[in-house]
Amino acid sequence: PEPPTACREKQYLINSQCCSLCQPGQKLVSDCTEFTETECLPCGESEFLDTWNRETHCHQHKYCDPNLGLRVQQKGTSETDTICTCEEGWHCTSEACESCVLHRSCSPGFGVKQIATGVSDTICEPCPVGFFSNVSSAFEKCHPWTSCETKDLVVQQAGTNKTDVVCGPQDRLRA
């Protein structure tokens, strides 16, 4: 019969014949022959392969370097790599999470719109009219200005995006 020119899924073509790929978590030791099946071996400790493959070497698990602010989020297996994340208060500098930086704080006049996660930084928003923030914070949203009228007081000093309204007593008309 004609030698194959293409193989089925989970097979690879070598020496004019189709051999089985090694399953995830295993590496190739020897190709199949006319008489023998593909020979595979499990990856060693701290190694992985995450696809059907014909690799002769497994990949090394990622190291979550504490000196770079990293910690293990999920331990690697023979089929998956280790997933790193950042220590509390830090976030990854890239999708691959190879290093971490400190979460940004929102300055006075800005509030937190979205708190930082292990993979994204704090998102700040300018305090809109009627709101203020007088602190630098990675958690606090803008606060609404105090409503003087609900306390039977009047506005003595207008609020800004950084300061609250100052309320004071209503001027009493003298008789």
Epitope: I115, T117, E125, P128, G130, E140, K141, P144, T150
Partner: antibody, heavy 118, light 110 residues
Framework: CQSVEESGGRLVTPGTPLTLNCTVS????????MNWVRQAPGKGLEWIGV?????EIFYASWAKGRFTISKTSTTVDLKITSPSTEDTATYFC??????????????WGPGTLVTVSS | AYDMTQTPASVEVAVGGTVTIKCQAS??????LAWYLQKPGQPPKLLIY???KLASGVSSRFEGSGSGTQFTLTISGVQCDDAATYYC????????????FGGGTEVVVK
Amino acid sequence: CQSVEESGGRLVTPGTPLTLNCTVSGFSLSSYDMNWVRQAPGKGLEWIGVIWNNGEIFYASWAKGRFTISKTSTTVDLKITSPSTEDTATYFCAGDADGGVVSYFHVWGPGTLVTVSS
Amino acid sequence: AYDMTQTPASVEVAVGGTVTIKCQASQTIYTYLAWYLQKPGQPPKLLIYEASKLASGVSSRFEGSGSGTQFTLTISGVQCDDAATYYCQQGYNSRHVDNVFGGGTEVVVK
């Protein structure tokens, strides 16, 4: 596609605590503020409270002590601490997509019915 | 504490007509107001936010206006499908409130 769905509504006897769940998909609770709103049969909308994306919780003045809001990474829960017959209503979970300090309810669940009766 | 009063409670309007719903806040909420419509058995749907901005996919027959404490929703060229209950909602303050919603206005289309 962003969606929320409430569950846990059922018939309970007065005084029996009940927890409702709101499961979100298509968005993260670290960016959305989540509100609980209820509607008694034939009545208007009544806001119960909100859990902000930063974890802060605020309740309507009438709801303090009667309800507890909490969240995990994908669900927002509402505990009715000691239901009475006046708590019979459809309970909605509603999400505010912006995450800023001004709250509008962009995403609503279909609601879950709670009936309190002896 | 930021009470929202809606008027009228119910209004009847002919197809093609115009209906106006008012919402009053007990103290200033600037322009932080939204309008919703709700049909029986369904959750509310956001129509307008920031007092006058149309939510995605909402017909331009719906128009919101106002600021401070006085707000209006106007529906022009009313259609049968507009029959629903409409609610206003203050988006300004979650901290000291009884209810962020107005009492609702039922629109009946003749």
